[in-house]
Amino acid sequence: KSEMPQPVSIQDINHRVWVLQDQILIAVPRKDRVSPVTISLISCRHVETLEKDRGNPIYLGLNGLNLCLMCAKAGDQPTLQLKEKDIMDLYNQPEPVKSFLFYHSQSGRNSTFESVAFPGWFIAVSSEGGCPLILTQELGKANTTDFGLTMLF
């Protein structure tokens, strides 16, 4: 079966939302004039070839913008990037495209997104507002890795 991406809105536990600024995703407090991006997520169709019990492997895109989140090394460190990519092209590939995949884990209302290409690295936002989304190995310290997802229909 061919799936369709699920539109969601994402905010962190400090009620900051994701906005696109100069092709970079940043987390800012939700205000009247802030227009958060809508995230599209779709499960990898090759789930049986990925690690069990780590979460649901998903691709994350920016709804209607042909941009997807991916992880790539910059020097020694994995970094979070936005790449021009159709999320359905990733979904339909004959193998999991690991650099674009994240294990989505849910605990109660909280979600985390762990890089499939770089296990142990999670999407995070700095505890200070107005900062770009990053990848971190350090959970629950200076960075927030727990997010809330709201399904949009």
Partner: antibody
């Protein structure tokens, strides 16, 4: 530079097993997929299967399920193909290849030199 | 299981254009088959040419192009060079497994 170097030719008796190695250099096998393909004398290519060295998951062509076993040793950056219950029809050159995503698609970008396995009584 | 068929042999003149095709026994080849093309020159290792039907692998000369043509996957060599004399194999994806064709022996004469 990127290279896949395979083990040498093997001669085996029917019913025996063989293990072919494919040592990678110039890249980490955990960052890609390793495919195995064979070519019988005067024939086309046949896909055997593939392994994801990062987590060890495999896919096999139905024909090779139970016949072939794919493994890796990430500490030595080496992939292995083991074939069991060999028959004369398994006489072929066996190739490993890197199947990598670059930009917008997956490609077979690097191949081993091939290992001839001869099954003869 | 699907059978993938290629022309056993083709000949092209130097500088000429030739199209190799890849037919599926299950019907028309589509982009969902993610056609791959690989080349094997005599006495040399294989080289990947095309992935995803029409995406050239890094470093592959622009004279090689992939497409869909009349329900088949196609590899076109425009301005063939003597060094293009080789065996060419296509591979098509069917759900979670890959099937190779029998190969085309291309002579540049």
């Amino acid at each position: 530079q990127v290279q896949l170097v395979q083990s040498g030719a093997e001669v085996k008796k029917p019913g025996a097993s063989v293990k072919v190695s494919c040592k990678a250099s110039g890249f980490n096998i955990k960052d890609t997929y390793i495919y195995w393909v064979r070519q019988a004398p005067g024939q086309g290519l046949e896909w055997i299967g593939r392994i994801d060295p990062a987590i060890g998951t495999t896919r096999y062509d139905p024909k090779f399920q139970g016949k072939a076993t794919l493994t890796t040793d990430t500490s030595t950056n080496t992939a292995y193909l083991e074939l069991s219950s060999l028959r004369s029809e398994d006489t072929a050159v066996y190739y490993c290849a890197r199947y990598d995503y670059s930009g917008s698609s997956f490609y077979f970008d690097y191949w081993g030199q091939g290992t001839l396995v001869t099954v003869s009584s | 299981q699907a059978v993938v068929t290629q022309e056993p042999s083709l000949t092209v003149s130097p500088g000429g254009t030739v199209t190799l095709t890849c037919r599926s026994s299950t019907g028309a080849v589509t982009t969902s088959n993610y056609a791959n093309w690989v080349q094997q020159k005599p006495g040399q290792a294989f080289t990947g040419l095309i992935g995803g039907t029409n995406d050239r692998a890094p470093g592959v000369p622009a004279r090689f192009s992939g497409s869909l043509l009349g329900g088949k996957a196609a590899l076109t060599i425009s301005g063939a060079q003597p060094e293009d004399e080789a065996d060419y194999f296509c591979a098509l994806w069917y759900s979670n497994h890959l099937v190779f064709g029998g190969g085309t022996k291309l002579t540049v004469l």
